[in-house]
Protein backbone atom coordinates (compact mmCIF):
# COMPACT_ATOMS: atom_id res chain seq x y z
CA UNK A 1 0.00 0.00 0.00
CA UNK A 2 3.05 2.26 0.04
CA UNK A 3 4.17 4.60 2.76
CA UNK A 4 1.44 6.45 4.63
CA UNK A 5 2.02 9.98 5.86
CA UNK A 6 -0.25 12.32 7.76
CA UNK A 7 -0.67 15.91 6.68
CA UNK A 8 0.28 18.26 9.49
CA UNK A 9 -3.04 20.07 9.25
CA UNK A 10 -5.77 19.48 11.79
CA UNK A 11 -8.81 21.53 12.62
CA UNK A 12 -8.91 20.20 16.17
CA UNK A 13 -12.34 18.90 15.30
CA UNK A 14 -12.58 15.81 17.48
CA UNK A 15 -9.87 16.69 19.96
CA UNK A 16 -10.29 17.26 23.65
CA UNK A 17 -7.62 19.93 23.38
CA UNK A 18 -8.47 22.23 20.45
CA UNK A 19 -4.96 23.67 20.40
CA UNK A 20 -3.20 20.50 19.31
CA UNK A 21 -3.57 17.63 16.90
CA UNK A 22 -5.59 14.81 18.44
CA UNK A 23 -3.53 12.10 16.74
CA UNK A 24 0.20 11.78 16.36
CA UNK A 25 1.27 13.16 13.01
CA UNK A 26 3.44 10.15 12.23
CA UNK A 27 0.96 7.37 12.96
CA UNK A 28 -1.91 6.09 10.91
CA UNK A 29 -4.91 4.03 11.95
CA UNK A 30 -5.57 0.97 9.81
CA UNK A 31 -9.21 0.57 10.87
CA UNK A 32 -11.86 0.90 8.17
CA UNK A 33 -14.07 3.95 8.17
CA UNK A 34 -11.30 6.35 9.16
CA UNK A 35 -10.71 7.54 5.61
CA UNK A 36 -12.83 8.80 2.76
CA UNK A 37 -12.23 10.07 -0.76
CA UNK A 38 -10.20 13.26 -0.75
CA UNK A 39 -12.13 16.39 -1.68
CA UNK A 40 -11.54 17.37 -5.29
CA UNK A 41 -9.65 20.48 -4.22
CA UNK A 42 -6.80 18.24 -3.01
CA UNK A 43 -6.42 16.48 -6.36
CA UNK A 44 -2.83 17.67 -6.72
CA UNK A 45 -1.89 17.60 -3.03
CA UNK A 46 -0.02 14.28 -3.12
CA UNK A 47 2.86 14.52 -5.57
CA UNK A 48 4.01 10.90 -5.72
CA UNK A 49 1.17 9.06 -4.08
CA UNK A 50 -2.56 9.01 -3.58
CA UNK A 51 -4.69 11.19 -1.35
CA UNK A 52 -7.14 10.07 1.29
CA UNK A 53 -9.12 12.12 3.76
CA UNK A 54 -8.75 11.58 7.50
CA UNK A 55 -12.37 11.59 8.66
CA UNK A 56 -11.63 12.41 12.31
CA UNK A 57 -9.58 15.47 11.36
CA UNK A 58 -11.17 16.46 8.04
CA UNK A 59 -7.74 16.80 6.52
CA UNK A 60 -5.87 15.22 3.59
CA UNK A 61 -3.27 12.51 4.02
CA UNK A 62 -0.97 10.95 1.45
CA UNK A 63 -0.19 7.30 0.81
CA UNK A 64 3.15 7.48 -0.95
CA UNK A 65 4.29 5.46 -3.90
CA UNK A 66 7.19 3.15 -3.13
CA UNK A 67 10.43 5.08 -2.84
CA UNK A 68 8.83 8.39 -1.82
CA UNK A 69 8.32 10.03 1.56
CA UNK A 70 7.15 13.34 3.02
CA UNK A 71 3.78 14.82 3.91
CA UNK A 72 3.06 15.25 0.21
CA UNK A 73 5.24 12.33 -0.99
CA UNK A 74 7.51 15.01 -2.38
CA UNK A 75 10.89 13.52 -1.40
CA UNK A 76 12.79 10.55 -2.71
CA UNK A 77 13.50 8.02 0.03
CA UNK A 78 17.28 7.75 -0.07
CA UNK A 79 17.14 4.54 1.96
CA UNK A 80 14.67 2.81 -0.34
Amino acid sequence: DGNSTRSPETNGLLCGDPEENCAATTTQSKRKGHFSRCPKQYKHYCIKGRCRFVVAEQTPSCVCDEGYIGARCERVDLFY
Partner: antibody, heavy 116, light 106 residues
Framework: QVQLLESGGGLVQPGGSLRLSCAAS????????ISWVRQAPGKGLEWVSY????????NYADSVKGRFTISRDNSKNTLYLQMNSLRAEDTAVYYC?????????WGQGTLVTVSS | DIQMTQSPSSLSASVGDRVTITCRAS??????LGWYQQKPGKAPKLLIY???SLQSGVPSRFSGSGSGTDFTLTISSLQPEDFATYYC????????FGQGTKVEIK
Protein backbone atom coordinates in the same frame (compact mmCIF):
# COMPACT_ATOMS: atom_id res chain seq x y z
CA GLN B 1 -5.93 30.07 23.86
CA VAL B 2 -5.94 30.17 20.08
CA GLN B 3 -5.65 33.72 18.73
CA LEU B 4 -5.42 35.13 15.22
CA LEU B 5 -4.82 38.85 14.84
CA GLU B 6 -5.05 40.52 11.43
CA SER B 7 -3.47 43.84 10.55
CA GLY B 8 -2.56 45.93 7.53
CA GLY B 9 -5.98 46.96 6.32
CA GLY B 10 -6.85 50.48 5.28
CA LEU B 11 -7.90 52.75 2.44
CA VAL B 12 -6.22 52.22 -0.93
CA GLN B 13 -6.90 53.53 -4.43
CA PRO B 14 -8.01 51.24 -7.26
CA GLY B 15 -4.97 49.62 -8.83
CA GLY B 16 -3.02 49.95 -5.59
CA SER B 17 -1.44 47.35 -3.33
CA LEU B 18 -1.74 46.32 0.29
CA ARG B 19 -0.17 43.62 2.43
CA LEU B 20 -2.17 42.01 5.20
CA SER B 21 -0.64 40.11 8.11
CA CYS B 22 -2.09 37.60 10.55
CA ALA B 23 -0.21 36.90 13.78
CA ALA B 24 -1.05 33.53 15.34
CA SER B 25 -0.62 32.36 18.91
CA UNK B 26 -1.90 29.67 21.26
CA UNK B 27 -1.28 26.74 18.93
CA UNK B 28 1.54 25.17 16.92
CA UNK B 29 1.25 27.39 13.86
CA UNK B 30 3.66 25.34 11.73
CA UNK B 31 1.34 22.31 11.87
CA UNK B 32 -1.78 23.99 10.51
CA UNK B 33 -3.14 25.12 7.19
CA ILE B 34 -4.39 28.71 7.26
CA SER B 35 -6.86 30.56 5.03
CA TRP B 36 -8.02 34.05 4.19
CA VAL B 37 -11.79 34.61 4.00
CA ARG B 38 -13.38 37.97 3.22
CA GLN B 39 -16.76 39.60 3.69
CA ALA B 40 -17.89 42.65 1.75
CA PRO B 41 -19.96 45.15 3.77
CA GLY B 42 -23.43 43.73 4.34
CA LYS B 43 -22.65 40.68 2.22
CA GLY B 44 -21.81 37.02 2.72
CA LEU B 45 -18.56 35.13 3.23
CA GLU B 46 -16.11 34.47 0.40
CA TRP B 47 -13.10 32.18 0.72
CA VAL B 48 -10.01 33.85 -0.78
CA SER B 49 -7.02 31.53 -0.41
CA TYR B 50 -5.34 28.87 1.70
CA UNK B 51 -1.81 27.69 2.30
CA UNK B 52 -0.69 24.38 3.72
CA UNK B 53 1.51 24.03 6.80
CA UNK B 54 4.78 24.09 4.87
CA UNK B 55 3.78 26.76 2.36
CA UNK B 56 4.06 24.40 -0.63
CA UNK B 57 0.39 23.83 -1.46
CA UNK B 58 -1.68 26.91 -2.23
CA ASN B 59 -5.04 27.64 -3.83
CA TYR B 60 -6.92 30.83 -4.68
CA ALA B 61 -10.46 31.81 -5.53
CA ASP B 62 -10.84 32.69 -9.20
CA SER B 63 -11.77 36.26 -8.25
CA VAL B 64 -8.28 36.97 -6.86
CA LYS B 65 -6.06 34.60 -8.86
CA GLY B 66 -3.08 36.40 -10.38
CA ARG B 67 -3.54 39.45 -8.15
CA PHE B 68 -3.23 38.10 -4.60
CA THR B 69 -0.39 36.06 -3.11
CA ILE B 70 -0.61 34.14 0.14
CA SER B 71 2.53 33.26 2.11
CA ARG B 72 3.61 32.38 5.62
CA ASP B 73 6.62 32.61 7.90
CA ASN B 74 6.49 29.73 10.37
CA SER B 75 9.43 31.15 12.32
CA LYS B 76 7.32 34.24 13.04
CA ASN B 77 3.95 32.48 13.36
CA THR B 78 2.62 34.87 10.74
CA LEU B 79 0.46 34.58 7.64
CA TYR B 80 0.49 37.18 4.85
CA LEU B 81 -1.71 38.24 1.96
CA GLN B 82 -0.13 40.46 -0.69
CA MET B 83 -2.90 42.17 -2.63
CA ASN B 84 -2.07 43.87 -5.93
CA SER B 85 -4.19 45.51 -8.65
CA LEU B 86 -6.92 46.14 -6.12
CA ARG B 87 -10.47 46.78 -7.32
CA ALA B 88 -13.53 48.34 -5.70
CA GLU B 89 -15.05 44.86 -5.39
CA ASP B 90 -12.14 43.80 -3.15
CA THR B 91 -13.51 46.09 -0.43
CA ALA B 92 -14.23 43.82 2.52
CA VAL B 93 -13.31 42.71 6.00
CA TYR B 94 -10.51 40.17 5.60
CA TYR B 95 -10.34 37.35 8.13
CA CYS B 96 -7.58 34.84 8.61
CA UNK B 97 -8.91 31.49 9.75
CA UNK B 98 -7.29 28.26 10.86
CA UNK B 99 -7.77 25.37 8.45
CA UNK B 100 -7.87 24.68 4.74
CA UNK B 101 -11.19 22.88 4.34
CA UNK B 102 -12.97 24.05 7.48
CA UNK B 103 -12.29 27.04 9.67
CA UNK B 104 -12.42 26.39 13.39
CA UNK B 105 -10.77 29.61 14.64
CA TRP B 106 -11.05 33.08 13.13
CA GLY B 107 -9.43 36.44 13.71
CA GLN B 108 -11.44 39.60 14.30
CA GLY B 109 -10.81 40.80 10.74
CA THR B 110 -9.22 43.85 9.14
CA LEU B 111 -11.10 46.22 6.84
CA VAL B 112 -9.77 46.91 3.35
CA THR B 113 -11.44 49.77 1.47
CA VAL B 114 -10.64 50.27 -2.21
CA SER B 115 -11.84 53.68 -3.32
CA SER B 116 -10.66 56.77 -5.13
CA ASP C 1 -17.41 26.10 -9.45
CA ILE C 2 -19.93 24.64 -7.04
CA GLN C 3 -22.75 27.02 -6.10
CA MET C 4 -24.39 26.78 -2.68
CA THR C 5 -27.99 27.97 -2.36
CA GLN C 6 -29.49 28.50 1.08
CA SER C 7 -33.17 28.84 1.87
CA PRO C 8 -34.82 30.78 3.22
CA SER C 9 -32.69 33.92 3.00
CA SER C 10 -34.29 35.10 6.23
CA LEU C 11 -36.82 33.84 8.74
CA SER C 12 -38.58 35.07 11.85
CA ALA C 13 -38.94 32.76 14.82
CA SER C 14 -39.58 32.78 18.55
CA VAL C 15 -37.57 31.41 21.43
CA GLY C 16 -38.31 27.69 21.75
CA ASP C 17 -39.17 27.24 18.07
CA ARG C 18 -37.68 24.49 15.94
CA VAL C 19 -35.82 26.10 13.05
CA THR C 20 -34.67 24.42 9.84
CA ILE C 21 -32.35 25.92 7.24
CA THR C 22 -31.60 24.15 3.97
CA CYS C 23 -28.58 24.29 1.70
CA ARG C 24 -28.40 22.89 -1.81
CA ALA C 25 -25.20 22.27 -3.77
CA SER C 26 -25.15 22.64 -7.55
CA UNK C 27 -23.42 19.24 -7.75
CA UNK C 28 -22.78 16.36 -5.38
CA UNK C 29 -20.32 17.08 -2.55
CA UNK C 30 -20.74 13.80 -0.60
CA UNK C 31 -20.71 15.08 3.01
CA UNK C 32 -18.11 17.83 2.62
CA LEU C 33 -20.23 20.52 4.20
CA GLY C 34 -19.92 22.81 7.21
CA TRP C 35 -22.29 25.22 8.95
CA TYR C 36 -21.29 28.51 10.59
CA GLN C 37 -23.03 31.04 12.80
CA GLN C 38 -22.19 34.74 12.57
CA LYS C 39 -23.40 37.57 14.78
CA PRO C 40 -23.16 41.25 13.72
CA GLY C 41 -19.64 42.62 13.95
CA LYS C 42 -18.19 39.23 14.90
CA ALA C 43 -16.27 36.50 13.13
CA PRO C 44 -18.12 33.34 12.10
CA LYS C 45 -18.18 30.32 14.40
CA LEU C 46 -18.01 26.71 13.17
CA LEU C 47 -21.03 24.69 14.29
CA ILE C 48 -21.16 21.54 12.16
CA TYR C 49 -18.61 19.77 9.97
CA UNK C 50 -18.85 16.76 7.65
CA UNK C 51 -22.57 17.58 7.26
CA UNK C 52 -23.62 16.13 10.60
CA SER C 53 -20.75 16.20 13.12
CA LEU C 54 -21.08 18.69 15.98
CA GLN C 55 -18.04 20.86 16.57
CA SER C 56 -16.61 20.68 20.08
CA GLY C 57 -18.32 23.09 22.48
CA VAL C 58 -21.40 23.65 20.32
CA PRO C 59 -24.77 23.02 22.05
CA SER C 60 -26.54 19.79 21.13
CA ARG C 61 -29.66 21.70 20.00
CA PHE C 62 -27.76 22.25 16.74
CA SER C 63 -27.74 19.34 14.31
CA GLY C 64 -26.95 18.79 10.67
CA SER C 65 -28.06 16.22 8.13
CA GLY C 66 -27.89 15.41 4.44
CA SER C 67 -25.46 14.21 1.81
CA GLY C 68 -24.93 14.63 -1.90
CA THR C 69 -26.64 17.88 -2.82
CA ASP C 70 -29.22 18.56 -0.09
CA PHE C 71 -28.35 19.51 3.48
CA THR C 72 -30.17 20.78 6.54
CA LEU C 73 -29.24 22.65 9.71
CA THR C 74 -31.75 22.27 12.52
CA ILE C 75 -31.98 24.18 15.79
CA SER C 76 -34.27 22.05 17.95
CA SER C 77 -35.27 24.78 20.40
CA LEU C 78 -34.22 28.30 19.49
CA GLN C 79 -32.48 30.23 22.26
CA PRO C 80 -32.03 34.03 22.53
CA GLU C 81 -28.34 33.74 21.65
CA ASP C 82 -29.16 31.86 18.42
CA PHE C 83 -30.50 34.91 16.58
CA ALA C 84 -27.77 35.35 13.96
CA THR C 85 -26.89 34.66 10.33
CA TYR C 86 -26.06 31.08 9.34
CA TYR C 87 -23.87 30.02 6.42
CA CYS C 88 -23.25 26.65 4.80
CA UNK C 89 -19.89 25.96 3.17
CA UNK C 90 -18.84 23.18 0.82
CA UNK C 91 -15.25 21.98 0.77
CA UNK C 92 -15.23 19.33 -1.93
CA UNK C 93 -14.18 21.61 -4.75
CA UNK C 94 -12.57 24.92 -3.78
CA UNK C 95 -14.37 26.31 -0.74
CA UNK C 96 -17.62 28.18 -1.36
CA PHE C 97 -20.24 29.53 1.03
CA GLY C 98 -23.97 29.87 0.74
CA GLN C 99 -25.43 33.38 0.73
CA GLY C 100 -26.56 33.13 4.35
CA THR C 101 -29.82 32.82 6.28
CA LYS C 102 -30.69 35.50 8.81
CA VAL C 103 -32.66 34.25 11.81
CA GLU C 104 -34.58 37.13 13.36
CA ILE C 105 -36.84 37.53 16.39
CA LYS C 106 -40.54 37.28 15.58
Amino acid sequence: QVQLLESGGGLVQPGGSLRLSCAASGFTFSRYWISWVRQAPGKGLEWVSYIDSTGTFINYADSVKGRFTISRDNSKNTLYLQMNSLRAEDTAVYYCARGGSLFDYWGQGTLVTVSS
Amino acid sequence: DIQMTQSPSSLSASVGDRVTITCRASQGIISYLGWYQQKPGKAPKLLIYAASSLQSGVPSRFSGSGSGTDFTLTISSLQPEDFATYYCQQYDALNTFGQGTKVEIK
